[in-house]
Interface confidence: medium
Amino acid sequence: QRLPRMQEDSPLGGGSSGEDDPLHEEDLPSEEDPPREEDPPREEDLPEVKPKSEEEGSLKLEDLPTVEAPGDPQEPQNNAHRDKEGDNQRHWRYGGDPPWPQVSPACAGRFQSPVDIRPQLAAFCPALRPLELLGFELPLLPELRLRNNGHSVQLTLPSGLEMALGPGREYRALQLHLHWGAVGRPGSEHTVEGHRFPAEIHVVHISTAYARVEEALGRPGGLAVLAAFLEEGPEENSAYEQLLSHLEEIAEEGSETQVPGLDVSALLPSDLSRYFRYEGSLTTPPCAQGVIWTVFNQTVMLSAKQLHALSDALWGPGDSRLQLNFRVTQPLNGRVIEASFPAEVDSSPRAAEPVQLNSCLAAGD
């Protein structure tokens, strides 16, 4: 499905279902009353029981491109987050103190993400070729780490998933994560003519020019994110079910599980040729700029039950549900969003010609 041609005064769309059925998990048991191993107890953890976590370096993928951000005043968000494995960033949360620029000064930058996309104002850029993905079809083994990091659900990807934005601009995938809303409330990060979609997937990549995330942060083109909107459709999405069926396993903040490998490309739209492109930032602290964003025009369809499961299965810090984990859209500040395809003529009689006021700037892309 393509992005809707919406009028400026269109009400925001919702995508969650009202279903109360729990997510049925065929593949893994859920944590109805999970018998877990306890870490050495700390006062702040009791009486909760946490799973053992693997030790990692000081800078973790979940500290960086999980790509979320502060709350929209019109979308109250309640998800305080502090990564218990040791955040690289100071404490931050959606929709509350501290202001993100205090957490990371880059969050006050001029070229931040997400943004509102207005297709009619995008610059058609024929040089934007279909994306090329290599190695995204993963075998079942080895298993992958799926983690509730308190502000999203994140799948850590193995080496070997390669993506090219163009000749000589190669990237490897690091992780993917989702953004969502709540029952009756959409939760995508990017919007299209003000329309917020039920959810959004981000696949975060690092340029092959850099060996480590720290080196790529803030460098132009150092990181690249593929983004797609998730919408409600009539059928279950079997690719997403391979992740969603494990959510009850990681209901608690900080918990993780192992999931079989899957075809990561199946989580993205089938049409990789029609997309919007702009330069922005990570959407959570550290909000590093220079991130190349690719937002697909085609949406991905999930069933109402799947969208409901996504928005209702996880918990953030304390007793708060992990919901509405998106950042308010940021001003373009003169940036031009490019499109790999010409804007379509509206079906309404008054729209005779596509109105594209901007020209393609990145001819060599």
């Epitope: 049925h24 065929e26 048991p29 859920s30 944590e31 780490r145 396993e249 192992q258």
Partner: antibody
């Protein structure tokens, strides 16, 4: 072919401890989640404990929580079950079993090792 | 925890006849159900997973059906080598739980 061989069972007094081992071969051990399942004499099967492929996620049955500890050494292709504060109700054949890579059934089982708790 | 109840406790079937074993869950387990065969003195062997999918090298005479709370294992033509105890197991919610077993023998 896939092989799971348990060892470490024996006779132990109530309150005592035992450490069971399971040696795995014929597959990439570090890629599979594992469980211990036990069977009391003449009884049915009872799941005891689970450990994910990396060891990052662990579960226990309520009946053994706080007394048993599951662990694995992927470098040695070995699974372990440390059993403390044993009681007569823990007398059973203990099987180590491999979880399927995708669905969560147990596709390969060892032949079991017998643990007898008696004074 | 989810309680799995198998019936009958013992099933005697004539050679070549069909054996039908039932397993009921105390609450829905979707299709997160497996069947195992355990012969005397041996370890259990996986027959069926996801309620109806035969495991590797399991002959077609074994079939599974059902979802939610009611499940059935069918042995289409019972032979002497099928004499065993059959267990169902749910893996939809922790803790993993097994049924009490159905002992199948030859009439």
């Amino acid at each position: 072919q896939v092989q799971l061989v348990e060892s470490g069972g024996g006779l132990v007094q109530p309150g005592g401890s035992l450490r069971l081992s399971c040696a795995a071969s014929g597959f990439t051990f570090s890629s599979y989640s594992m469980s211990w399942v036990r069977q009391a004499p003449g009884k049915g099967l009872e799941w005891v404990s689970y450990i994910s492929s990396s060891g990052s996620t662990i579960y226990y049955a309520d009946s053994v929580k706080g007394r048993f500890t599951i662990s694995r050494d992927n470098a040695k292709n070995s699974l372990y079950l440390q059993m403390n504060s044993l009681g007569a109700e823990d007398t059973a054949v203990y099987y180590c079993a491999r979880h399927r890579s995708y669905r969560f059934a147990l596709d390969y089982w060892g032949q079991g090792t017998t643990v007898t708790v008696s004074s | 925890e989810i309680v799995m109840t198998q019936s009958p406790a013992t099933l005697s079937v004539s050679p070549g006849e069909r054996a039908t074993l039932s397993c009921r869950a105390s609450q829905s387990v979707s299709r997160g159900l497996a069947w195992y065969q355990q012969k005397p003195g041996q370890a259990p062997r996986l027959l069926i997973y996801s309620a109806s999918t035969r495991a590797t090298d399991i002959p077609a005479k074994f079939s599974g059906s059902g979802s939610g709370t009611e499940f059935t294992l069918t042995i289409s033509s019972l032979q002497s080598e099928d004499v065993a105890v059959y267990y169902c197991q749910q893996y939809n919610k922790w803790p993993l739980t097994f049924g009490g077993g159905t002992k199948v023998d030859i009439k």
